[in-house]
């Protein structure tokens, strides 16, 4: 079936903006006014992947940009990355299950868990002007909470 | 080889309970999903709702007050409970295992039990 | 959810006919429709899987096609043990859904 996509911005519980930082990485930092429009627009796809009641998979994709966040191993730890696609394939219903991250409502807030590693959130730092990351606890020290701001196409 | 065996079926009063097993072998429950299914004598077939490898769960909405499907993993054996029952919950219930092909596959099924009957009459 | 209209509800045929089955669904499912052989008193056992691919050991005489909304399973020469009744299960979305059945008879 055609793949079900829709554009928004993330902001963390902190109300930190996503920005790009060089070309293969995201970072959370504080934007006001006219700033604001460095924060990246996803396109948020509704993908398959293993649904129940509460969770709903879905893909983060760059708007207009062929690159998705994906989850991988690097030096044996699950780690968040943007990868690069091709963008005659994507995206597709059927994305692999490194591009897949389950969208957790909970309190009016959102938690991105990764499908290929379970229990591994989507996570910003407290600090200012860190890298997005792949986060292996909850309720810690780092963020995993988001609101999603929805953007016309 | 890939067996899936139902049981626990029976006669259940009106107002009741129920709660099936289904045995597996020849997978994972931890890789593999598993769906409960039913059939009305002489109907169709109804999806109920499954359970993950990773144990979270999807419930068709009409029944999804009075199901829980739930695994034990080391016992390789999948449980639906199923409460209220009345006499249109008379079914033979089926146990099936999804194929859980990433990116190809996800929710098909391919291998089923045998069912087990159960009879919900005062 | 999506719907699965499957027709007819029952088939009369003879051995060696060829015969057809129509399943459309309420949204576009790709290529994610399935089919079912159910005997009485039997699981219902997968025929064919999406992708209108033939299980193994399947005999060649069964066949599908179709993709988005509309889908056809097609026996092309009867046999005596292929009377039972045939279902389709889209499997592009949960709720995973059914169609009502297709009870193959001897004419």
């Known amino acids: 079936a055609p793949v079900r996509s829709l554009n928004c911005t993330l902001r963390d519980s902190q109300q930190k903006s996503l920005v790009m930082s060089g070309p293969y990485e995201l970072k959370a930092l504080h934007l006001q006014g006219q700033d604001m429009e460095q924060q990246v627009v996803f396109s948020m796809s509704f993908v398959q992947g293993e649904e129940s009641n509460d969770k709903i998979p879905v893909a983060l994709g760059l708007k207009e940009k062929n690159l998705y966040l994906s989850c991988v191993l690097k030096d044996d730890k699950p780690t968040l990355q943007l990868e690069s696609v091709d963008p005659k394939n994507y995206p597709k219903k059927k994305m692999e299950k490194r591009f897949v991250f389950n969208k957790i409502e909970i309190n009016n807030k959102l938690e991105f868990e990764s499908a290929q590693f379970p229990n591994w959130y989507i996570s910003t730092s407290q600090a200012e002007n860190m890298p997005v990351f792949l986060g292996g606890t909850k309720g810690g020290q780092d963020i995993t909470d988001f609101t999603m701001q929805f953007v016309s196409s | 080889e890939v067996q899936l065996v139902e049981s626990g079926g029976g006669l259940v009063q009106p107002g009741g309970s129920l709660r099936l097993s289904c045995a597996v072998s020849g997978f994972t429950l931890s890789d593999y999903g598993v769906s409960w299914i039913r059939q009305a004598p002489g109907k169709g077939l109804e999806w109920l709702g499954l359970?993950?490898?990773?144990?979270?769960?999807y419930y068709n909405s009409p029944l999804k007050s009075r199901l829980t499907i739930s695994k034990d993993n080391s016992k390789s054996t999948v449980y639906l409970q199923m409460n209220s029952l009345r006499a249109e919950d008379t079914a033979v219930y089926y146990c099936?295992?999804?194929?859980?092909?990433?990116?190809?596959?996800?929710?098909?099924?391919?291998?089923w039990g045998q069912g087990t009957l159960v009879t919900v009459s005062s | 959810d999506t719907q699965v209209t499957q027709s007819p509800s029952s088939l009369s045929a003879s051995v060696g006919d060829r015969v057809t089955i129509t399943c459309i669904t309420s949204?576009?499912?790709?290529?994610?429709m399935n089919w079912y052989q159910q005997k009485p008193g039997k699981p219902p056992k997968l025929l064919i899987s999406?992708?209108?691919t033939l299980r193994p050991g399947v005999p060649s005489r069964f066949s599908s096609s179709g993709s988005g909304t509309d889908f056809t399973f097609t026996i092309s020469s009867l046999q005596p043990e292929d009377f039972a009744t045939y279902y389709c299960l889209q499997s592009d979305n949960l709720p995973l859904t059914f169609g009502q059945g297709t009870k193959l008879e001897i004419k």
């Open positions: 099936a295992k999804q194929r859980t092909l990433w990116g190809y596959d996800l929710y098909g099924m391919d291998y």
């Open positions: 999406q992708g209108n």
């Open positions: 359970i993950w490898g990773g144990g979270d769960t």
């Open positions: 949204t576009d499912i790709d290529v994610d």
